[in-house]
């Protein structure tokens, strides 16, 4: 229950805390766990134990174990454990899972990213950020405190992010780095009743005969992931495939996702060498989901 | 109404096993230290046993190796497995909350049982 | 192990009179919290411990007032200033610092 897993890179400021924690006023010793032997509490040593805390400065590979802290409260003396390992620094770029803290999500309205475990430590801003080993530049990342703010979250802003900070201890530096990986989730969506953008009521549409022609049918059905959304186009109250007409054919638009969040959708209604008596039809717009449907109508009329 | 229900006890022979159960009610129970205390008949309080929130135990020399603490907190229960059983055992043996492990604080044990009887006895 | 010694083994009293109680342990019961952990504790005839006063001076929730605690260090006192026939049995102290030690007791009982 009181057993924690901690890790580091070689030459990095490493500092565990007592998993078993006390108040502040509580002694706290500390022991290697293999052999029992008691870790100094002076700070001249690389590894020394400072109450709750226990600092590596810097840690070595060979540092790795367990340790036993033991938090003289009163009735009992409670004990804790801390299982420390301490990598070899990678050469190339890619952050191996066991050196990964943990996962963290956003979405457009909320992309904090906090550095991890940046709290044990003595730091002072700014942090440097870098995501899959670059570092983060541009107007849209902003290092604020102990976290990174990323402005107009996207899907591709997926992925790795380290944070590095210096470390200070009685006026010697010394290098951390942490990662963690950060996934963008879409905001808890809602459906709505379908809005067509596209075209508007009655719309005439003016065409060149012999001429192609285009008509897009565009409608918004809420925010998010949407269960069930279409939008389709009909000829005199007939499906497209049902009419049987080569010339005009629908296909799909891309997938719309607005700046104001809002999940849309697009069909093309493409009419190839306009005919005279393509203008005597009615073109509809559809345009459904579990809230209902919403119909636009369009005419089309020869261009002057 | 915080509360703590000892049952378990009962006659044994020397050298015999007998596990004792606490039912607490009325608070969370899985935050605080529990103990055993025993005492013998016109004698004093005497402590037996105590586990942490953790599961970690503490015993006096007197029953170490003997007895054996637990806990069970989705059973809001505490127990007392006591082995080798000796006529020095023979006691009231009360089951009694201490302090919330969690944030450290303190109150005196401050909720005891009823007590249940153990006698040790060919 | 810490010892707890308290005195008198018997107090006989009087209603309405004041009493004092008094334990020893055998090493300082200040943690380094800056708390002294000494409890007093009352088993009357028949029933369970309850607890009386707690960290040394604190008095537990339903507790008459004329109960007090006082002491540091080594040294502690519980008093009652104006005992009741009620107030019968035996008073335990307790130390909590290293596990959990009990005084001898003192039994109180009317003149």
């Known amino acids: 229950k009181f057993s924690k897993q901690s890790w580091g890179l070689e030459n990095e400021a490493l500092i565990v805390r007592c998993p078993r924690q006390g108040k502040p006023s509580y002694t706290v010793d500390w022991y290697y766990s293999q052999t029992n032997k008691s870790i100094p509490t002076q700070e001249r040593n690389r590894v020394f134990a400072s109450g709750q805390l226990l600092k590596f400065l810097p840690a070595e590979v060979a540092d790795s174990g367990i340790y036993t802290c033991i938090v003289r409260s009163p009735t009992f003396n409670r004990t804790g454990y801390a299982n420390v390992t301490i990598y070899k620094k990678q050469s190339d770029c890619n952050v191996p899972d066991y050196l990964m803290y943990s996962t963290v999500s956003g979405s457009e309205k909320n992309s904090k990213i906090y550095c991890p475990t940046i709290d044990l430590y003595n730091w002072t801003a700014p942090l440097e950020w870098f995501k899959n080993c670059q570092a983060l530049q541009g107007s849209r990342y902003r290092a604020h405190k102990s976290f990174l703010v990323i402005d107009n979250v996207m899907t591709e802003d997926a992925g790795d992010y380290t944070c590095k900070f210096i470390h200070n201890e009685n006026g010697a530096n010394y290098s951390v780095t942490a990662t963690r990986s950060f996934t963008v989730k879409d905001e808890q969506g809602f459906s709505l009743f379908p809005v067509i953008g596209a075209p508007a009521q009655n719309e005439i549409k003016e065409v060149e005969i012999g001429k192609n022609a285009n008509l897009t049918c565009s409608a918004c059905f809420g925010k998010g992931t949407q269960f069930l959304a279409a939008v389709l186009w009909q000829l005199n109250g007939t499906k497209i495939t049902d009419f049987g007409e080569p010339r005009i054919q629908q296909e799909e638009g891309q997938n719309q996702s607005f700046s104001n969040g809002l999940a849309c959708l697009d069909m093309v209604l493409r009419i190839a060498d306009v005919k005279e008596e393509d203008l005597l039809l009615q073109y509809d717009c559809l345009a459904l989901n579990l809230h209902g449907l919403r119909r636009h109508t369009v005419r089309l009329s020869r261009k002057n | 109404e915080v509360q703590l229900v000892e049952s378990g006890g009962g006659l044994v022979q020397p050298g015999g096993s007998l596990r004792l159960s606490c039912a607490a009610s009325?608070?969370?129970?899985?935050?605080?230290?529990m103990h055993w205390v025993r005492q013998t008949t016109g004698k004093g309080l005497e402590w037996v046993s105590a586990?942490?929130?953790?599961?970690?135990?503490y015993y006096p020399g007197s029953v170490k190796g003997r007895f054996t603490i637990s806990r069970e907190d989705a059973k809001n229960s505490l127990y007392l497995q006591m082995n080798s059983l000796r006529a020095g055992d023979t006691a009231v043996y009360y089951c009694?909350?201490?302090?919330?492990?969690?944030?450290?604080?303190?109150?005196?044990?401050?909720?005891w049982g009823q007590g249940t009887t153990v006698t040790v006895s060919s | 192990d810490i010892v707890m010694t308290q005195s008198p083994l018997s107090l006989p009293v009087t209603p309405g009179e004041p009493a004092s109680i008094s334990c020893r342990s055998s090493?300082?019961?200040?943690?380094?919290?800056?708390?002294?952990?000494l409890d007093w504790y009352l088993q009357k005839p028949g029933q369970s411990p309850q607890l009386l006063i707690y960290l040394g001076s604190n008095r537990a929730s339903g507790v008459p007032d004329r109960f007090s605690g006082s002491g540091s260090g080594t040294d502690f006192t519980l008093n009652i200033s104006r005992v009741e026939a009620e107030d019968v049995g035996v008073y335990y102290c307790m130390q909590a610092l290293q596990t959990l030690t009990f005084g001898g007791g003192t039994k109180v009982e009317i003149k």
């Open positions: 009694a909350r201490g302090g919330d492990g969690y944030n450290y604080d303190y109150y005196g044990i401050d909720v």
């Open positions: 586990i942490d929130l953790a599961g970690d135990t």
């Open positions: 009325g608070f969370t129970f899985s935050t605080y230290d």
């Open positions: 090493q300082s019961l200040l943690h380094s919290d800056g708390y002294h952990y």
